[in-house]
């Protein structure tokens, strides 16, 4: 495939990523899946500047990231090493917490209303934003 | 694996500059925070800066501000520090590390100020 | 600036639990990660977010959080682990690293 060089109609670019910010919820399978489905992933924070640049653009809602913890340690879901990583917990967070009675603990994480991260039950009906690298191969074929 | 490696002991006079230098690898050089820090003979560590290399932003502490300059050229994976108008408490040994939490530390470089 | 307050000197017996404390109020917002130093040696990370250890680091090894303290707790303390303790966290901006003063750990 060839190099994306601009980001899609409804992307927003930064830092040679774009970025697609939902305005319905979905729990975090279904919004792993519609990001994979636009040859994207649920974003990955690697720095303070990314941080701020996603929560300036999603404000004070609870909105899924690309971190979960569903087959034990916590996981990017690019493969971006997690113990070496930036990260942005809440106090006292994560706690995969059981007194939700929903079953089971909390495996998925989000950004909260002031920014900072948490892990939450991941069936949860959260808005989410979807990341793509600009430098990356584009799926679809060049255009001749 | 990771590993940092620093370059050599130095001596200068007070009022020099002194650039430090940390060569990473076995790891994507962009993907990790790295950062500066020094410890005085007997003392404890004390952060000198930050420097996210894949943009190249940096946070010095307000200590150093003006006179510590964090740049790194991804092209050879290596950080540089470089400390101005130096004066005898600047003796230490400087170390770089690199992670968020500073996951992995080089071998530290010995800075002597001496007239 | 943020600070954090550790004891400069705690002992324990062969064998026995000991906990190093590090206090400060940057740490009601951002974890403390905690640094083993052996002297003539660099500093190894034993403890980041919460409670979690890098491969390699003992499972004596914990950490907890409680207000404006941080704990590193060592379950069966061993002659290796004679060394300084460092804690750090982040200041309130989040992006400027604070070190506590260090506690140097004997083993008797």
């Known amino acids: 495939g060839s190099e994306r060089t601009c980001c899609p109609v409804n992307w927003v670019e930064h830092e040679r990523s774009c970025y697609w910010f939902s305005r319905s919820g979905k729990a975090w399978a279904d919004a792993d899946n519609y990001c994979r489905l636009e040859d994207a992933h649920l974003v990955v924070v690697t720095s303070w500047e990314e941080q701020k640049f996603v929560q300036h653009h999603i404000g004070p809602v609870n909105t899924w990231m690309g971190l979960h913890d569903q087959n034990g340690p916590w996981k990017w879901v690019d493969g971006t090493d997690y113990e070496t990583g930036f990260k942005n917990w809440r106090p006292e967070q994560p706690d995969d917490w059981y007194g939700h009675g929903l079953g089971g603990g909390e495996d998925c994480a989000h950004f909260t209303d002031d920014g900072r991260w948490n892990d939450d039950v991941c069936q949860r009906p959260y808005r989410w934003v979807c990341e793509t690298e600009l430098d990356k191969a584009s799926q679809e074929p060049p255009l001749l | 694996q990771v590993q940092l490696v620093q370059s050599g002991a130095e001596v200068k006079k007070p009022g020099a500059s002194v650039t430090v230098s940390c060569k990473a690898s076995g790891y994507t050089f962009r993907s990790y925070y790295m950062y500066w820090v020094r410890q005085a003979p007997g003392q404890g560590l004390e952060w000198v800066g930050t420097?996210?290399?894949?943009?190249?932003?940096?946070d010095y502490a307000q200590k150093f501000q003006g006179r510590v300059t964090m740049t790194r050229d991804t092209s050879t994976s290596t950080l540089y520090m470089e400390l101005n108008s130096l004066r005898s408490e600047d003796t230490a040994v400087y170390y770089c590390?690199?992670?968020?939490?500073?996951?992995?530390w080089g071998q530290g470089t010995l800075v002597t100020v001496s007239s | 600036s943020s600070e954090l307050t550790q004891d400069p000197a705690v002992s324990v017996a062969l064998g026995q639990t000991v906990r190093i404390t590090c206090q400060g109020d940057?740490?009601?917002?951002?974890?403390a990660s905690w640094y083993q130093q052996k002297p003539g040696q660099a500093p190894i990370l034993v403890i980041y977010t919460k409670n979690s250890r890098p491969s390699g680091i003992p499972d004596r090894f914990s950490g907890s959080t409680s207000g404006n303290t941080a704990s590193l707790t060592i379950t069966g303390a061993q002659a290796e682990d004679e060394a300084d303790y460092y804690c750090?966290?982040?200041?309130?901006?989040?992006?400027?690293?604070?070190f506590g003063g260090g506690t140097k750990l004997t083993v008797l």
């Open positions: 590390a690199s992670g968020w939490e500073l996951n992995y």
């Open positions: 420097i996210n290399p894949s943009g190249g932003s940096t």
């Open positions: 750090n966290s982040r200041d309130s901006s989040g992006n400027h690293v604070v």
């Open positions: 940057s740490l009601r917002n951002y974890y």
